[in-house]
Interface confidence: low
């Protein structure tokens, strides 16, 4: 399907005469009849097999014909055809004189013909206009013509139908040669197949629209390349779905039993060395200058109470500095300018003169110490913390820092081993003198009831079409991971072939 376009450009009839030589009165009011037909070696009268078209009166005698295409006018003249363009044609253009307004052939006198031209030849489809000029003894006609394809038709002879679409049946535009050009994100013969997100796993992922990646059962992640481990798997991984392979240092069915607290939690601070001492139990060996269960407390140089005579110690970047009370001086406030007359003994201490009054000594009441009875006796001296707890002086009180497994103000209480619910799958926990014991429900065994003894749901090979079967341990059921091209809970249904193209 296409259009033969004829653009009349200029008609010259300087003398204003008819083909018979008779002049027009008052001038030749000229219109044209065009006949387009199949190729004839000698163009002869007969049916205009490709179509006909007539113009209104375009001018008198000699005139140029205005390009009226943009305004929807009649120049170029349009001769549509609904067949494959054969590449050859015959064209007859007649110029007629219209004495009146009726331009029908039967309404015109037979000698109203001004001129007639007939051409034939080859013409390929294309945008280029072929310019031609035909001259007779009295007239000259300049015109150009071309053949172009109708909308949605393409190819060298306008025989290729292609209509862009973006729906269920295809997502494409048409190339200049009529072939399909898929819209971004689509592929396939008719551009019906979406291109999944780049990197989407071929077997484990699929998509229903471009740049999507939907995961098949048992797979996850942006590209569906990560298997989903067993439900409840804490510190384990999988290489196929529903596995739970424990990371190093973890044990149990769900890999939730910590066998390496040091590595997993790094509890020891400030460069201390950590040693595992049982499940969730550890010991920190502190570097010099640090203390505390986790070596989290920095041993200040002031902790050794270097300032004497009631001096206050202030930490510095490197070392400490003593702020001395009145009457004392020196690096540690060790030098005194006082005597008993200055009442230097605090907290009810008694002053005794020495060296003929040049010096003194304080005798302190119970719970106080120091050269001026200025210090309370260290509350940690008696080590009140039980079970290896560490005593810390903190402000006006003391505090016991307990080792793992103990609690209470003085670390006197033993934490139950069963408090952590260590028995899996509903096992019953019993505290013993040296640890614990699990009583397992039916179907489970092992020290922590972590071993499953029930049947394997995949044993009966329930999956079709070479699908992979996985057992869901928590429900005793199976899951089939279908290969590409199959769906269904057992992968029993082939994916439907794409529907035939609707043209």
């Amino acid at each position: 399907s296409g259009v033969f376009q004829l653009q009349l450009q200029e008609f010259i009839n300087e003398r204003g005469v008819l083909a018979s030589g008779r002049p027009c009165e008052p001038g030749c009011r000229t219109f044209f009849r065009v006949c387009l037909k199949h190729f004839q070696a000698v163009v002869s009268p007969g049916p205009c097999t490709f179509g006909t078209v007539s113009t209104p009166v375009l001018g008198t005698n000699s005139f140029a014909v205005r390009d009226d295409s943009s305004g929807g006018g009649r120049n170029p003249l349009q001769l549509p055809f609904n067949f494959t363009w054969p590449g050859t044609f015959s064209l007859i253009i007649e110029a007629w004189h219209a004495p009146g307004d009726d331009l029908r052939p039967e309404a015109l006198p037979p000698d109203a013909l001004i001129s007639k031209i007939a051409i034939q030849g080859s013409l390929a489809v294309g945008q280029n206009w072929l310019l031609d000029e035909q001259t007779s003894t009295l007239t000259r006609l300049r015109y150009s013509y071309r053949v172009i394809c109708s909308d949605n038709y393409y190819g060298d002879n306008c025989s290729r139908l292609c209509k862009k679409r973006n729906d269920h049946f295809g997502h494409y535009v048409c190339q200049p040669d009529g072939n399909l050009s898929c819209l971004p994100g689509w592929t396939g013969e008719y551009c019906q197949q979406p291109i999944c997100l780049s990197g989407c796993h071929e077997q484990n992922g699929y998509c229903s629209k471009p740049a999507e990646c939907l995961c098949r059962p048992g797979w996850q992640g942006r590209l569906c390349n990560e298997c989903i481990p067993h439900n409840g798997c804490r510190h384990g991984t999988c290489s196929t779905p529903w596995q739970c392979t424990c990371d190093e240092g973890w044990g149990g069915l769900f890999c939730d039993q910590d066998l390496n607290y040091c590595t997993h939690h790094s509890p020891c601070k400030n460069g201390a060395t950590c040693s595992n001492s049982g499940q969730r139990s550890y010991t920190c060996t502190c570097r010099p200058g640090y203390t505390g269960v986790d070596c989290e407390l920095e041993l200040s140089e002031c902790d050794s109470n270097p300032c004497r005579n009631g001096g206050s110690c202030k930490d510095q970047e490197d070392g400490y500095h003593c702020l001395c009370p009145p009457g004392y001086y020196g690096l540690h406030c060790e030098h005194s300018t006082l005597s008993c007359a200055d009442s230097p003994c605090f907290n009810g201490g008694s002053c005794r003169e020495r060296n003929q009054g040049a010096n003194y000594a304080c005798e302190c009441p119970p719970n106080f110490t120091g050269s001026n009875c200025e210090k309370k006796v260290d509350r940690c001296t008696s080590n009140p913390c039980a079970n290896g707890g560490q005593c810390l002086n903190r402000g006006p009180s003391r505090m016991c820092r307990c080792r793992p497994g103990f609690t209470g103000t003085y670390c006197e209480l033993h934490v139950s081993d069963c408090a952590r619910n260590p028995c899996a799958h509903g096992g019953t926990c019993h505290d013993l003198e040296n640890g614990l014991m699990c009583t397992c429900p039916a179907g489970f065994s092992g020290r922590r009831c972590e071993v499953r003894t029930s049947i394997d749901a995949c044993a009966s090979s329930p999956c079709f079409n070479r699908a992979t079967c996985y057992t869901d341990l928590s429900t005793d059921t199976f899951v089939c991971n279908c290969p590409y091209g199959f769906v269904g809970s057992r992968c029993e249904f082939p994916v439907g072939l794409p529907p035939s193209f609707p043209w």
Epitope: A124, G126, D156, V173, Q175, P176, N179
Partner: antibody
Framework: QVQLVQSGAEVKKPGASVKVSCKAS????????MHWVRQAPGQGLEWMGI????????SYAQKFQGRVTMTRDTSTSTVYMELSSLRSEDTAVYYC???????????????WGQGTLVTVSS | EIVLTQSPATLSLSPGERATLSCRAS??????LAWYQQKPGQAPRLLIY???NRATGIPARFSGSGSGTDFTLTISSLEPEDFAVYYC??????????FGQGTKVEIK
């Protein structure tokens, strides 16, 4: 990515012909129309013509009709523009430009060659 | 053929200022108009197509408007790299594809 690489600069005498090539890569060669646009020194852009690489059909600006010939070689994904009867006013940079295709046949030029300087001098 | 007339021929502005370039068509081109930027020694670069759509990778400071016969390219705040020659081009009525004569945006 789409690339259009043109042949090197040419110096020609008046009356001679010049043939400039434009090699396309990074896309399906036959799926996009190719245009030629020229630019005289210090002047604006002037459209010369278009070629359909699929069938080899062309359309030329009226000004160049009879002097310009655009061809293509699908085996090498190359289009050619030959301009004959050169005169001094044909001294210009000649660009090939790929037409961006959509449902309408005439679109814009997103991808251009680097340009080929043709100097016409006696 | 459709003639595109650009104004002004030269626009002298400082970085940070707003640039407004005009393109007028001799007859309606609907919204089928594009804008290109060209720097010395380089091929043109497509900025705007179909009057108001930014081409891939073009910064948001470039915007186009208009339809029919009157079109405008606006650069909201000139960057140093925006000083160049700008051409409009129509695809409404072809052949030929026609370009405007260009507007040079220079540093004041």
């Amino acid at each position: 990515q789409v690339q259009l690489v043109q042949s090197g600069a040419e110096v020609k005498k008046p009356g001679a012909s010049v043939k400039v090539s434009c090699k396309a890569s990074g896309y399906t060669f036959t799926s996009y129309y190719m245009h030629w646009v020229r630019q005289a020194p210090g002047q604006g852009l002037e459209w010369m013509g278009i070629i359909n690489p699929s069938g080899g059909s062309t359309s030329y600006a009226q000004k160049f009709q009879g002097r310009v010939t655009m061809t293509r070689d699908t085996s090498t994904s190359t289009v050619y523009m030959e301009l004959s009867s050169l005169r001094s006013e044909d001294t210009a940079v000649y660009y090939c430009a790929r037409e961006e295709y959509s449902s309408r046949s005439a679109e814009y030029f997103q991808h251009w060659g680097q340009g080929t300087l043709v100097t016409v001098s006696s | 053929e459709i003639v595109l007339t650009q104004s002004p021929a030269t626009l002298s502005l400082s970085p940070g200022e707003r640039a407004t370039l005009s393109c007028r068509a001799s007859q309606s081109v609907s919204s089928y108009l594009a804008w290109y930027q060209q720097k010395p020694g380089q091929a043109p670069r497509l900025l705007i197509y179909d009057a108001s759509n930014r081409a891939t990778g073009i910064p948001a400071r470039f915007s186009g408007s208009g339809s029919g016969t009157d079109f405008t390219l606006t650069i909201s705040s000139l960057e140093p790299e925006d000083f160049a020659v700008y051409y409009c081009q129509q695809r409404s009525n072809w052949p030929p594809w026609t370009f405007g004569q260009g507007t040079k945006v220079e540093i004041k």
